[in-house]
């Protein structure tokens, strides 16, 4: 799986989209989980409505919401009031029984608000991150990075990455 990088500004909302084949995943609930590092397990954050036909209803867990367009094949996750601790690796998943298929791997990066002059030691500034060794680009903001590329993105985005 490529990893798609979504960048958002601290304090603002970030929308993550995960496209999928609506026929292949027909009848399946979806979930959004946070991965504990690249090698760690994925811990469930929020999942779509227990009744698949009601998947379009937005469900919240804290500041994270999920909604599923089952006909169009797009899962949308909203991270409200983005904070530095929200940065990291996530997965969009399609659930069947006790199994989960990965629809998309996502890296969320939290950018400093250029208008906020408080200490931003915890926040990511374009150019500071380690280079993505095998990424590829899309555009909340999103793009995929090429091998060895160090991202110097615009101020709020979505990238792609292996």
């Amino acid at each position: 799986h490529n990893t798609t990088v979504f960048q958002g500004v601290a304090g603002q909302s970030l929308q993550v989209s995960c496209p999928y084949d609506s026929m292949k995943h027909w009848g399946r609930r979806k979930a959004w989980c946070r991965q504990l590092g690249e090698k760690g397990p994925c811990q469930r954050v929020v999942s779509t409505h227990n009744l698949w036909l009601l998947s379009f209803l937005r469900r919240w867990n804290g500041s994270t919401a999920i909604t599923d367009d089952t006909l169009g094949g797009t899962l949308t996750i909203t991270l409200r009031n983005l904070q530095p601790h929200d940065a990291g690796l996530y997965q969009c998943q399609s659930l069947h029984g006790s199994e989960a298929d990965t629809l998309r791997k996502v890296l969320v990066e939290v950018l400093a608000d250029p208008l906020d002059h408080r200490d931003a030691g915890d926040l990511w500034f374009p150019g500071e991150s380690e280079s993505f060794e095998d990424a590829h680009v899309e555009h909340s903001i999103s793009r995929s990075l090429l091998e060895g590329e160090i991202p110097f993105p615009p101020t709020s985005h979505h990238h792609h990455h292996h």
Epitope: L36, E38, P41, Q43, A87, L89, E130, E133
Partner: antibody
Framework: QVQLQQPGAEPLTPGASVKMSCEAS?????NFWITWVKLRPGQGLEW???????????NYNEKFKSRATLTVDTSSTTAYMQLSSLTSEDSAVYYC?????????????WGHGTLVTVSA | DVLMTQSPLSLPVNLGDQASISCKSS???????????LEWYLQRPGQSPKLLIY???NRFSGVPDRFSGSGSGTDFTLKISRVEAEDLGLYYC?????????FGGGTKLEIK
Amino acid sequence: QVQLQQPGAEPLTPGASVKMSCEASGYTFTNFWITWVKLRPGQGLEWIGDIYPGSGNTNYNEKFKSRATLTVDTSSTTAYMQLSSLTSEDSAVYYCAREAYYTNPGFAYWGHGTLVTVSA
Amino acid sequence: DVLMTQSPLSLPVNLGDQASISCKSSQNIVHSNGNTYLEWYLQRPGQSPKLLIYKVSNRFSGVPDRFSGSGSGTDFTLKISRVEAEDLGLYYCFQGSHVPYTFGGGTKLEIK
């Protein structure tokens, strides 16, 4: 900038316990794994275990599992390793280290190490 | 546990020479996620180790391009194209794919 601060030295006696600290600064503490590594002169590096501060998840080297306990205090952004029932074999430098980035788990940031000396 | 075997134990070189260090793992070190977590570290006397290479062949930020990593499966190599004085020290390979993660025994790069 990312910094991991460790106390310089811990002189101890056999059978004692030690709780080593690793104070992290310059980044969001809960977002990255912290690893502990042992260095004995002439013996090379040995991986003890790691901990994810955001959840408390741990992995241990079975060799240390019965005597080493990894914990974190997120309020003080400090990782700890407690080592019990010390013997002279535990005399070593103990490093804490942090992974480089979400997509690069290599140990890019290291503390200066705590020298543990166990002698009667 | 995965045993990481480095060779040679000691590597005497002239400055400007090429140096090559081998690291063999006792089993395949591909992680369940498809990545191979093979890293190379340099430890200079009295200093903490320094990350040089991650995921077999990716140079870490700020590492000179004279350092290169290669390999797959169980055989890995670190090459230094032109050795400089600051490159001297102990080199360790490390596998972070299978718990417990393990280091190689180290290779001492020294002046001939």
